[in-house]
């Protein structure tokens, strides 16, 4: 229903706390360089204005759209052109073009320093002094680094953060209470960020239909007892929620997500037997819980689907009459039978089925043509299964760090032109798939591995789009989203690449490396490994292992030495010489 004042409507629905949080996230995701204080001031002004509209919906400007109100605020920021360059040109446009322009200027890799966590005492002091400001800083810092972070989910993580600080700041040993808990939240939030970015990419590049197909597959796996009409309704609603968040309409997105959660909890009987625990929780926790609820028990006696989709004489007639509905039903029926497949795989199978019908229904004898379609799925199913087996075996043998290094070598050989920091980030993220997925039960491994890899590779594509350097990467990134992972997996050594000349300074290290945290040490070593591969793309695994073991030994020796600086300056050049010889 239409409201006289959109801003009053959203303020009333969301309540002041969530309203302010979402406005802060929106501003931080649009203008990623502004300080917290600048944004906090804008948020307060918008909130005060919303309150006047709640009191009187006919007050001046209360009838304006949220895009108009927010855009006007952003465009009134002093020194916009000095700080944001051509983004200021967006302000010369009218809505809806102005908002589209803002969206296009979101930066997936902003040049901001890493978000450093203060030490425990300092954190607890500032949290106790002003919890609201502390949480505001958290929302601002995460949102500006992750401009597509799913806003209502970010509110959930802020709530988690709040609960952890409340608990741990009351403990004697704050540090050992905070560190593992906050690390856990950070890890989950980072995964949430890449997953949501993938959804927005799907929406931006391929439209709502592509996202809805993803949603149908995912929901059918999770709710195999729900009928097709129910799955379609949930997929349609979920598509709307994600479209709004990806489009910067965060107040509408959060409001609609709350509505969807309410609907699911009121209709558990027709959706799933597993929802009650989630539905007992407060709003943010409830919506989060529903988004990752365990799969319902599969029905006991689902028939084979060949009867309706291959053997039925009316297949082409049914397909021609309502293509999307017919394909949607196929995707639903296949997905509810296969919670052990990744969504990407299910979408590839549906795409193959669609292509087969397009071809066969135009022929003289369609049934003879499409009769073998389900058997033709087998290689498509075996490929990711083999990928999971091979990679999980390797992970179990090497551990996370060794597995990351193996992936780093592989991907540097596939795309040596890509910048070393991007390769290291990608390999470290791809390597975490082992820890995340390989320890799961057999039937959960494939969906975990492939859908996570797809999300990480989406980020590789986004970073590469900014500065395209590798034809291999461009080729894999320009295809459909679901074909990306198989495309990257199939890449081999880039034969067109001219090896980098050996620069001693790339492999020269100083004693400051000794005091770095373990993670930073690993990144330094992995940076060196990528550079070695760029110098010798065809180096064998044994050669690289020899060099890396030597390197690790060198660091260990010099970091234990009484005079570290002397050790690094004398042993360093020897290491470089040995490396050159080992790779000759």
């Amino acid at each position: 229903e239409a409201h006289k004042s959109e801003i009053a409507h959203r303020y009333n629905d969301l309540g002041e706390q969530h309203f302010k949080g979402l406005v802060l996230i929106a501003f931080s995701q649009y203008l990623q360089k502004c300080s917290y204080d600048e944004h906090a001031k804008l948020v307060q002004e918008v909130t005060d204005f919303a309150k006047t509209c709640v009191a009187d919906e006919s007050a001046a400007n209360c009838d304006k759209s949220l895009h108009t109100l927010f855009g006007d605020k952003l465009c009134a920021i002093p020194n916009l052109r000095e700080n944001y360059g051509e983004l200021a040109d967006c302000c010369t446009k009218q809505e809806p073009e102005r908002n589209e322009c803002f969206l296009q200027h979101k930066d997936d890799n902003p040049s901001l320093p890493p978000f450093e966590r203060p030490e425990a005492e300092a954190m607890c002091t500032s949290f106790k002094e002003n919890p609201t400001t502390f949480m505001g800083h958290y929302l601002h810092e995460v949102a500006r680094r992750h401009p597509y972070f799913y806003a209502p989910e970010l509110l959930y993580y802020a709530e988690q953060y709040n609960e952890i600080l409340t608990q741990c700041c009351a403990e004697a040993d704050k540090e050992s209470c905070l560190t593992p808990k906050l690390d856990g939240v950070k890890e989950k939030a980072l995964v949430s960020s890449v997953r949501q970015r993938m959804k927005c990419s799907s929406m931006q590049k391929f439209g709502e239909r592509a996202f809805k197909a993803w949603a149908v597959a995912r929901l059918s796996q999770t709710f195999p007892n729900a009928d097709f009409a129910e799955i379609t309704k949930l997929a349609t609603d979920l598509t709307k929620v994600n479209k709004e968040c990806c489009h910067g309409d965060l107040l509408e997105c959060a409001d609609d997500r709350a509505e969807l959660a309410k609907y699911m909890c009121e209709n558990q009987a027709t959706i799933s037997s597993k929802l009650q625990t989630c539905c007992d929780k407060p709003l943010l926790k409830k919506a989060h819980c529903l988004s990752e609820v365990e799969h319902d028990t599969m029905p006991a006696d689902l028939p084979a689907i060949a009867a309706d989709f291959v053997e039925d004489q009316e297949v082409c007639k049914n397909y021609a009459e309502a293509k999307d509905v017919f394909l949607g039903t196929f995707l639903y029926e296949y997905s509810r039978r296969h919670p052990d497949y990744s969504v990407s795989l299910l979408l590839r199978l549906a795409k193959k089925y669609e292509a087969t019908l397009e071809k066969c229904c135009a022929e003289a004898n369609p049934p003879a043509c499409y009769g073998t379609v389900l058997a033709e799925f087998q290689p498509l199913v075996e490929e990711p299964k083999n990928l999971v087996k091979t990679n999980c075996d390797l992970y179990e043998k090497l551990g996370e760090y060794g597995f990351q290094n193996a992936i780093l070598v592989r991907y540097t050989q596939k795309a040596p032109q890509v910048s070393t920091p991007t390769l290291v980030e990608a390999a470290r993220n791809l390597g975490r798939v082992g820890t995340k997925c390989c320890t799961l039960p057999e039937d959960q491994r494939l969906p975990c591995v492939e859908d996570y890899l797809s999300a990480i590779l989406n980020r590789v594509c986004l970073l590469h789009e900014k500065t395209p350097v590798s034809e291999h990467v461009t080729k894999c990134c320009s295809g459909s989203l679901v074909e990306r992972r198989p495309c990257f997996s199939a890449l081999t050594v880039d034969e067109t690449y001219v090896p980098k000349e050996f620069k001693a300074e790339t492999f020269t290290f100083h004693s400051d490396i000794c005091t770095l945290p373990e993670k930073e040490k690993q990144i330094k070593k992995q940076t060196a490994l990528a550079e070695l591969v760029k110098h010798k793309p065809k180096a064998t695994a044994e050669q690289l292992k020899t060099v890396m073991d030597d390197f690790a030994q060198f660091l260990d020796t010099c970091c234990k030495a009484a005079d570290k600086d002397t050790c690094f300056s004398t042993e360093g050049p020897n290491l470089v010489t040995r490396c050159k010889d080992a790779l000759a």
Epitope: H295, T297, M298, A300, D301, L302, P303, A304, I305, A306, V310, E333, Y334, R337, H338, P339, D340, L374, A375, F377, Q378, V381, E382, P441, D443
Partner: nanobody
């Protein structure tokens, strides 16, 4: 071509136990359902127990607590452990394996519970 072979049936006294096996040969991929069905003389074939790809098990009310279904993925084999057998369990037991493309049935193995 997929072939399913059941074994382990036989004559047993009431209160006794049997373990049925069903092994699949040939190429069957993408299995989402494995089940045991039975058919007593003059009756419809009925589901006894099934196990889905996610490991969920389902049992007919009449066998709950007495029968246990399990599978060995590496051997493509399905089992049915039957304890506390009753004369009403007398039937031909069939195993059924499904992927989206088809429904594969064994020839059946006779189970007779009688004193």
């Amino acid at each position: 071509q997929v072939q399913l072979v059941e074994s382990g049936g036989g004559l047993v006294q009431p209160g006794g136990s049997l373990r049925l096996s069903c092994s699949a040969s040939g190429s069957i991929w993408g299995i989402y359902h494995m089940g045991w069905y039975r058919q007593a003389p003059g009756k419809q074939r009925e589901l006894v127990a099934s196990i889905t790809v996610d490991g969920s098990t389902h049992y007919a009310d009449t066998v709950k607590g007495r029968f246990t279904i399990s599978r060995d993925n590496s051997k493509n084999t399905l089992y049915l452990q039957m304890n506390s057998l009753e004369p009403e369990d007398t039937a031909v037991y069939y195993c059924d394996i499904r992927n989206v493309g088809g429904d594969y049935w064994g020839q059946g193995t006779q189970v007779t519970v009688s004193s």
